[in-house]
């Protein structure tokens, strides 16, 4: 099968669109329920969480919330807005206006034009605060995830059925099948549909075999297929890599732990904008690549690839995709160079016969036996070799 075309909504930057970018999460949570997949719907407004308006709560929003939270779809029994309004009556003609009263125009609504979370918007002051609250119970006994792939958008395909996570057999597994997985998870489109042993084998049951999606299904379990318990082993666990998965490499340096920062995202390699590339971002990247910690951030070169990615980390994240990130599809990095990094595990730091000293690092000999590299002022670290 040909690879599905990238969905249009993924080609917008968050700066241009009110819809949620895949790097962001729908700002919603469920509270006071029997599990993390049921309860009162709350949306985040700046620093606070507010109950979502019940009057404008519909099945599309319920479905979107459940999917966004990884809770499968919405159950039919979800408490939705009733067919007739349970609202205080309109004021009698001639009454003084009450709209200025903030408590009467206070509740936000989650409004969705479809059942996917990236088609939703939080609209402030959409309802009078009449006490009616949106509630949902999700079908948490069915869920989907990608595991052991270095992020939520790549890995071995696992389905939750009857309270147990299990694999999908790779017989007939192709891009259409992977595309359904990626779209269901909010991970864009499928870049690769992978057979067994590309990721670590699963351990639980095998829930599906002979999966044959058209690519248009909303959920993987809507695709034709067979129960998987008989003919497959875990050496045949299906995998997928989605367009929203990010992987990184350093190029043009002495080894894999030094060079220009490149991220594979939405099917292509991109450079990273150095205008927001600070020690915390460099630290996260070096550690995630198994390259130790960041020693310096050499001055970048002009972008040789399309540079559209920005990261903002606190330094404690496991990977750059756990940081706040922004992919600007409209403009290349404006007035910036391509980010570069030198990690502590790079052999260019350990090969003392190499005459070249990386920029902004000066070499000092102490007592003629210990060589110390003094990092530039931003980091002020000493590294003993």
């Amino acid at each position: 099968h040909p690879s599905p075309a990238p969905p249009d909504q993924l080609n917008t930057s968050s700066a241009e669109s009110e819809l949620w970018e895949p790097g962001e999460r729908l700002p919603v949570r469920l509270t006071n329920g029997s599990s993390s997949c049921s309860g009162t719907v709350e949306v985040r407004l700046e620093a606070s969480w507010e109950p979502a308006c019940g009057a404008l709560w519909d099945s599309r929003a319920a479905e979107a919330v459940c999917r966004a939270l990884g809770c499968g779809g919405a159950e039919a029994a979800s408490q939705l807005a009733p067919p007739t309004p349970e609202l205080p009556p309109p004021p009698a003609a001639g009454n003084t206006s009450v709209a200025a009263n903030a408590t009467l125009a206070g509740a936000p609504a989650l409004l969705c034009s479809g059942a996917e979370w990236r088609l939703c918007e939080v609209v402030e002051h959409a309802c009078r605060s009449d006490g009616r609250r949106a509630r949902v119970t999700c079908a948490e006994n069915r869920a989907l995830r990608l595991v052991d792939g270095g992020g939520a958008c790549a890995g071995r395909v696992e389905m939750l059925e009857h309270g147990e996570w299990g694999s999908v057999c790779d017989d007939t597994w192709d891009l259409e099948d992977a595309h359904v997985v990626c779209r269901q998870l909010g991970c864009g489109w499928a870049v690769q549909a992978l057979p067994g042993l590309h990721f670590t084998p699963g351990r639980g049951p095998i829930h599906r075999d002979q999966v044959n999606c058209s690519g248009a299904e909303a959920y993987l379990w809507d695709c034709p297929g067979l129960p998987g318990q008989h003919y497959c082993g875990h050496k045949e666990d299906a995998g997928a890599v989605c367009s929203e998965h990010q992987s990184w490499r350093l190029t043009g340096g002495a080894d894999r732990c030094e060079g220009q920062v490149e991220v594979h995202f939405r099917g292509v390699w991109n450079t990273v904008c150095d205008s927001e590339w600070y020690p915390s971002e460099a630290k996260v990247l070096c550690q995630s690549l198994g390259c130790g910690t960041a020693v310096e951030r050499p001055k970048g070169l002009p972008h040789s690839l399309s540079g559209r990615m920005y990261y903002s980390c606190n330094g404690e994240e496991l990977t750059l995709s756990n940081c706040s990130w922004r992919f600007n599809n409209s403009n290349l990095c404006s007035q910036s160079l391509a980010a570069r990094v030198l990690c502590s595990a790079s052999r260019s730091l350990h090969n003392l016969s190499t005459p070249e000293v990386p920029a902004s690092v000066q070499t000092v000999t102490i007592e003629s036996s210990v060589t110390v590299k003094i990092e530039n002022k931003e980091s002020r670290e000493l590294m003993l070799l």
């Epitope: 009733p82 067919p83 309004p85 609202l87 001639g94 009454n95 206006s97 609504a109 309802c127």
Partner: nanobody, 123 residues
Framework: QVQLVESGGGLVQPGGSLRLSCSAS????????LGWFRQAPGKEREFVAA????????YYADSVKGRFTISRDNSKNTLYLQMNSLRAEDTAVYYC????????????????WGKGTQVTVSS
């Protein structure tokens, strides 16, 4: 009883613009969230745009986002819909709606409907 009267409809060429107005009789106009729905021949009524009581929040159907702008003037008891880059598929009867309890995005919260004004986009 709030009476809503739409005006401004008519025939326009594709790519053209129109501005619809909706005037209300009610003195407590600002107590109502307002919006526009439309109905094309042989189709169900569909949501177009909504605005809250004070005009601080708006919401649009995907099909009109970026082309239509909803606004209100509480001092004139009037709701507006500025329609730009009109397409043949925008042809419909446009209805002004008012809701006391919530922005009129879903039909079950709507308290009052206008009688409608015809918009035809054709060359």
């Amino acid at each position: 009883q709030v009476q809503l009267v739409e005006s401004g409809g008519g025939l326009v060429q594709p790519g053209g613009s129109l501005r619809l107005s909706c005037s209300a009789s009610e003195r407590t106009f600002s107590d109502y969230a307002l919006g526009w729905f439309r109905q094309a021949p042989g189709k169900e009524r569909e949501f177009v745009a909504a605005i809250n009581w004070v005009g601080g929040s708006t919401y649009y159907a995907d099909s009109v986002k970026g082309r239509f702008t909803i606004s209100r003037d509480n001092s004139k008891n009037t709701l507006y819909l500025q329609m730009n880059s009109l397409r043949a598929e925008d042809t419909a009867v446009y209805y002004c709606v008012a809701s006391w309890g919530a922005m009129p995005v879903l039909t079950h919260v709507i308290n009052y409907w206008g009688k409608g004004t015809q918009v035809t986009v054709s060359s």
